[in-house]
């Protein structure tokens, strides 16, 4: 599940990884667009083992994965879910 949040909180990610995570181990992906207190876009990956990692938005593999998820969502809504948190 791909989620996009708009939040007034500061940056959530202290450290980012570009290491590939196979989709079979990913539970959901949370995207935090830049702005509202954080100058950069953030991507948070929730894994099947309940751990969480911030992924570098420039990592090729996450860009490919998000593109696949976006394409799929346009033809098979409601997945991914787009949630908006209004401050």
């Amino acid at each position: 599940v791909l989620e996009v949040y708009y939040t007034s909180l500061r940056c959530r990610c202290v450290q980012e990884s570009s290491v590939f995570i196979p989709r079979r181990f990913i539970d959901r992906i949370q995207i935090l667009p830049r702005g509202n207190g954080c100058p950069r876009k953030e991507i948070i990956v929730w894994k099947k083992n309940k751990s969480i990692v911030c992924v570098d938005p420039q990592a090729e593999w996450i860009q490919r994965m998000m593109e696949v998820l976006r394409k799929r969502s346009s033809s098979t809504l409601p997945v991914p879910v787009f949630k908006r948190k209004i401050p």
Epitope: V19, F20, I21, P22, R23, R24, F25, K47, K48, N49, S51, W61, M65, R72, T76
Partner: antibody, heavy 121, light 106 residues
Framework: EVKLVESEGGLVQPGSSMKLSCTAS????????MAWVRQVPEKGLEWVAN????????YYLDSLKSRFIISRDNAKNILYLQMSSLKSEDTATYYC??????????????WGQGTSVTVSS | DIQMTQSPSSLSASLGGKVTITCKAS??????IAWYQHKPGKGPRLLIH???TLQPGIPSRFSGSGSGRDYSFSISNLEPEDIATYYC????????FGGGTKLEIK
């Protein structure tokens, strides 16, 4: 040539522990996720656990996660499975398996010959 | 958890003939399915990944197709060495194997 060789299994008592190892060769071990899969006698295959490139991330079959620990030593090209509080239902052939590298479309490809573990009193 | 229902559990066919095995997932697995051949005393051998991509060295007699929840695997021009148990594996979300299909030659 990709080779995965499991250590000898054997007969163990219920409640005891056992550590399996798997020596890998013929590929860059640290470039791959690795896994353990088991086959209960006369039954099908069951995924047990997975580990990422450097051992910092592990995944388990829900019913096993409190008793089994997967680990790896990239310097020695060895994969491990520490099994504790063993039960009769853990009796199976355990396979060491090479998993995905950097492409989601790929599945577990190379398997060891398997090692037999029997839990019985 | 995703369940994989594989059928039939066993089948018998003639040399030179064709067999088809099916696997149905409990939800859409987005083509992330692999097929394995398993012979006694050996580790399973990957034949096909991502629904229809043949592994290097696997003859084109083996093929796979499907999408969504429904997938199939076929062997044509059956040969004696094809006697084995065949398994499907979904790897869209963790891993689940089908129950297996034991193939015998008439």
């Amino acid at each position: 040539e990709v080779k995965l060789v499991e250590s000898e299994g054997g007969l163990v008592q219920p409640g005891s522990s056992m550590k399996l190892s798997c020596t890998a060769s013929g590929f860059t071990f640290s470039d791959y996720y690795m896994a353990w899969v088991r086959q209960v006698p006369e039954k099908g295959l069951e995924w047990v656990a997975n580990i990422n490139y450097d051992g910092s991330d592990t995944y388990y079959l829900d019913s096993l996660k409190s008793r089994f620990i997967i680990s790896r030593d990239n310097a020695k090209n060895i994969l491990y499975l520490q099994m504790s509080s063993l039960k009769s239902e853990d009796t199976a052939t355990y396979y060491c398996v090479r998993d995905v590298a950097y492409d989601d479309s790929y599945a577990m490809d190379y398997w060891g010959q398997g090692t037999s573990v029997t839990v019985s009193s | 958890d995703i369940q994989m229902t594989q059928s039939p559990s066993s089948l018998s066919a003639s040399l030179g003939g064709k067999v088809t095995i099916t696997c149905k997932a409990s939800q859409d697995i987005n083509k992330y399915i692999a097929w394995y051949q398993h012979k006694p005393g050996k580790g399973p051998r990957l034949l096909i990944h991502y629904t229809s991509t043949l592994q290097p060295g696997i003859p084109s007699r083996f093929s796979g197709s499907g999408s969504g929840r429904d997938y199939s695997f076929s062997i044509s021009n059956l040969e004696p060495e094809d006697i084995a148990t065949y398994y499907c594996l979904q790897y869209d979300s963790l891993y689940t194997f089908g129950g297996g299909t034991k193939l015998e030659i008439k």
